[in-house]
């Protein structure tokens, strides 16, 4: 269930950004990475160091697949693992970090017009929690290659990075996902410190854009290494 | 600046009734969707219930299905929780938080709910 889920996570403690939120001086309210939790004079974010448990790679995040932990592994078994970057071995596209899509068993760079998408690839949902749609009725989305002349526009349901249109990324919304702007300079992000760490974050953030890369922020080096605010910085 | 304020909180036997307000000021982008979260002493914080504004879906946790209803209107930057047959397991600081399109995540003080035996 969902609750079981939540309390699989460990959370660490971020101290709270100087002058309100970051990138928001004197907000009332914080601005984190991922799903962040005011706790008393820290903020806490959710994010957990065992293997999360999955089905398919839609249940992963961003820079994630899922799939045995070990090679020829129980395959009733399986766990988000830490995206493959550009020529490493693929087996599917999901398995390519994004910005590359799988070809001939080696993770490529997509090229702008390229989408993963050729097969036809159906979301459906099924959770420990509820979820309905505000006007009563069940909802059952198909995502088809033939509906993608155009990409996604924010908002829209993804299955991953590639259906979304250029300077967005497919990020988790609740228990689905959908297009999100990709982050600029100076945003607030989130750093997966372990490989096949996996945030439960509800409300996912997207990576740093083109150039910029999740780094501690410069003011934040006095704290301890579990309590690091990460921005996006340029190379 | 974006600012969430809930209201609604307070002493209530159980069985009772209360409704939780979330009310979004300064908002200069649109929100992707909102959820109410709760922290109870000693606990973990645990997410309650969610409205996705952009899929038009809500969200519930088991522990509050069918008792707990979310609702709100974006266009009034306001979210809700309707929350009936109360237990004392639900005594908790309540949160509302924020899925924007800006790509901070907001999130506002809380408000104490105290459900007596």
């Known amino acids: 269930t969902l609750n079981s889920v939540l309390n699989s996570n460990a959370i660490k403690n971020l101290p709270p950004p100087l002058g309100g939120a970051a990138g928001h001086p004197g907000s009332a309210v914080s601005a984190a990475p991922g799903i962040l939790y005011p706790g008393g004079n820290k903020y806490q974010t959710i994010d957990n160091y065992q293997p999360y448990p999955c089905a398919e790679d839609e249940e992963c995040g961003t820079d994630e697949y899922c799939a045995s932990p070990t090679r020829g592994g129980d395959a009733g078994v399986q766990i988000c693992l830490a995206c493959r970057k550009r020529r490493k071995r693929c087996m599917r596209h999901a398995m390519c970090c994004p910005g590359n899509y799988c070809k001939n068993g080696i993770c490529v760079s997509s090229d702008q017009n390229h989408f993963r998408g050729e097969i036809e690839e159906t979301i459906t949902e099924s959770f420990g929690n509820d979820h309905s749609t505000l006007d009563g009725y069940s909802r059952r989305t198909t995502l088809s290659s033939k509906m993608y002349h155009t990409k996604g526009q924010e908002g829209s349901v993804c299955l991953r990075s590639s259906d979304c249109a250029s300077g967005l990324c497919c990020a988790r919304h609740f228990w689905s996902k959908i297009c999100k702007p990709v982050l600029k300079e100076g945003q607030v992000c989130t750093k997966h410190r372990r490989k096949g760490s996996h945030g439960l974050e509800i409300f996912q953030r997207c990576y740093c854009g083109e150039g910029l890369s999740c780094r501690i922020q410069k003011d934040h080096h006095q704290a301890s290494n579990s309590s690091r605010l990460h921005t996006c910085q340029r190379h | 600046e974006v600012q969430l304020v809930e209201s609604g909180g307070g002493l209530v036997q159980a069985g009772g009734s209360l409704r939780l307000s979330c009310a979004a000021s300064?908002?200069?982008?649109?929100?992707?969707?909102m959820g109410w979260f709760r922290q109870a002493p000693g606990k973990e914080r645990e997410f309650v219930a969610g409205i996705s504004w952009t899929l038009g879906r809500t969200y519930y946790a088991d522990s509050v299905k069918g008792r707990f209803t979310i609702s709100g209107d974006n266009a009034k930057n306001t979210v809700y929780l309707q929350m009936n047959s109360l237990k004392p397991e639900d005594t908790a600081v309540y949160f509302c938080a924020s899925d924007e399109s800006d790509a901070y995540n907001y999130w506002g003080q809380g408000t104490q709910v105290t459900v007596s035996s």
């Open positions: 300064g908002r200069t982008f649109s929100s992707y969707g």
